[in-house]
Amino acid sequence: IWELKKDVYVVELDWYPDAPGEMVVLTCDTPEEDGITWTLDQSSEVLGSGKTLTIQVKEFGDAGQYTCHKGGEVLSHSLLLLHKKEDGIWSTDILKDQKEPKNKTFLRCEAKNYSGRFTCWWLTTISTDLTFSVKSSRGSSDPQGVTCGAATLSAERVRGDNKEYEYSVECQEDSACPAAEESLPIEVMVDAVHKLKYENYTSSFFIRDIIKPDPPKNLQLKPLKNSRQVEVSWEYPDTWSTPHSYFSLTFCVQVQGKSKREKKDRVFTDKTSATVICRKNASISVRAQDRYYSSSWSEWASVPCS
Amino acid sequence: RAVPGGSSPAWTQCQQLSQKLCTLAWSAHPLVGHMDLREEGDEETTNDVPHIQCGDGCDPQGLRDNSQFCLQRIHQGLIFYEKLLGSDIFTGEPSLLPDSPVGQLHASLLGLSQLLQPEGHHWETQQIPSLSPSQPWQRLLLRFKILRSLQAFVAVAARVFAHGAATLSP
């Protein structure tokens, strides 16, 4: 058993049929010694008396809010949550496996630049009685500070018969050094509590590996005289790190016909303009990627050829 | 060339070669998520690689003030990785084909380090740990870790030379 926060405790249980469970001793936070009784949740049934209560925690029915009273007055509470371990593996019932970039990916994180700011998100099908708390650091043995906000519900989607809820959190490294080569990964830890079930999820990454620039901005076409060619131009996204002579991007320009089956013409360039042939009913799209490190491409910015 | 005492390197040549190094490093190990190398054993093996850290003056301001600190750090790293890529970690099983980018990567690391340091002048270099993994499994893991680490190192070096070529070239 360990303390998650004040008056909230997590009991770690090996979860299998007829498991013996864990013996837990609760102590009433009071100077009083006599006349103390214990109840669980809303029930008025007295579970025991005395300053301490010893219970065998085996299942969710044994978890909940234990309260010690004296003469009708509440002295203190202890909320017990369960953390299940099945076949040596901690349960992951609360969050959905996003399966990208690999199986058992519950948390996904992205950064728009090298400032040390990043966003993580996760999915669940649970809609109520759900709380999250997020902690983060750079490195684990001698951790350096990363400050995370509160997790918020950022999107709801319908997937078949189920509703899916996306939660996200923003974090900022306290003393970021955008130009340095990271040697210690960022660690993100999410505590999830659904009713009386506790689970924790972790992710470890370098900012450089989760970079995904915003799409290029101000995408414009300039027709070239007496030609089917056009000059496409664009600018670095506002959110990208500066100076651009140091934090450089590379770009992919694509000409795509109306039909998905039509052959795509692609050009790669380090410049912020390119000359392409504009076909009727086609569109021109541009996306960006860090020039020197192959992290994710941005989403496409697009304009119609006409 | 970077001349001892602080004259400028051939920024544009260094920029071109460092960008080529980036491309080669990703060709040699293009995978990002195929296995989490930080979860695997052998932590000590790549802990000793030289990293370009915050105080090394490789940020735009540091380069403007005095690029020599940064260039020395980059040179140190290039020599370190050049020795690693030439070691028996990259020979033996799993077999690398003769078209492997590792050969070109090795030669380009040497080329850039020579651009930074002319003959007859020696910046101190870092000792490379003696690593002779006997099992294919250990050797492959070590290759992947070295190449992932090299990708990060050459990305910073390429930024430095691109910025230098754009803002510090005579």
């Epitope: - | 040699a28 195929h34 099983e93 799993p94 077999s95 084909l97 078209d99």
Partner: antibody, heavy 120, light 107 residues
Amino acid sequence: QVQLVQSGAEVKKPGSSVKVSCKASGYTFTDQTIHWMRQAPGQGLEWIGYIYPRDDSPKYNENFKGKVTITADKSTSTAYMELSSLRSEDTAVYYCAIPDRSGYAFFIYWGQGTLVTVSS
Amino acid sequence: DIQMTQSPSSLSASVGDRVTITCKASRDVAIAVAWYQQKPGKVPKLLIYWASTRHTGVPSRFSGSGSRTDFTLTISSLQPEDVADYFCHQYSSYPFTFGSGTKLEIK
């Protein structure tokens, strides 16, 4: 895009030779090794060897040494595999293939295969 | 030479079934193992490399696992179009070798 186009099916007499070609396009021919595999009817695959066109250096599976010669013609971006002293056991589909760019021999692009039948 | 012992040599399963094919290398090949799918009369097609990395465009129902000597190809939910021969392949050591193949059919 990368393409490997092989020569057509051949029927040969025991003791004779056959030369199968593999024309490459869509990439720089001298940049990558070209490998040859064979698959006897209803059987698995066997790796025969490769040629690295940049320096014309072949490498063979010991089991095929003396039986196979692999060459390359840079001017036409074509690799060749010649089988000599043919026997009925050499009846198989022969494939050329090129591996991943990272320098490890897993095969991404394959020719369409050439059936060589050895029969008297 | 490294032997790649593949099993079963053939198997029949129903649409939607989870199918597992295994390959055992005669010595350590790290994770230098690929899996190929070959449909009747067609060319082998790369599915998995580095034991567990799916090649571009390969459906997520295909997954690979294992290291050193024991490797597995799994199809999580068999589809009619998965009828084919499947081969494992080690590219750790010369001469590169292949498993003898598994013929997969639909019941």
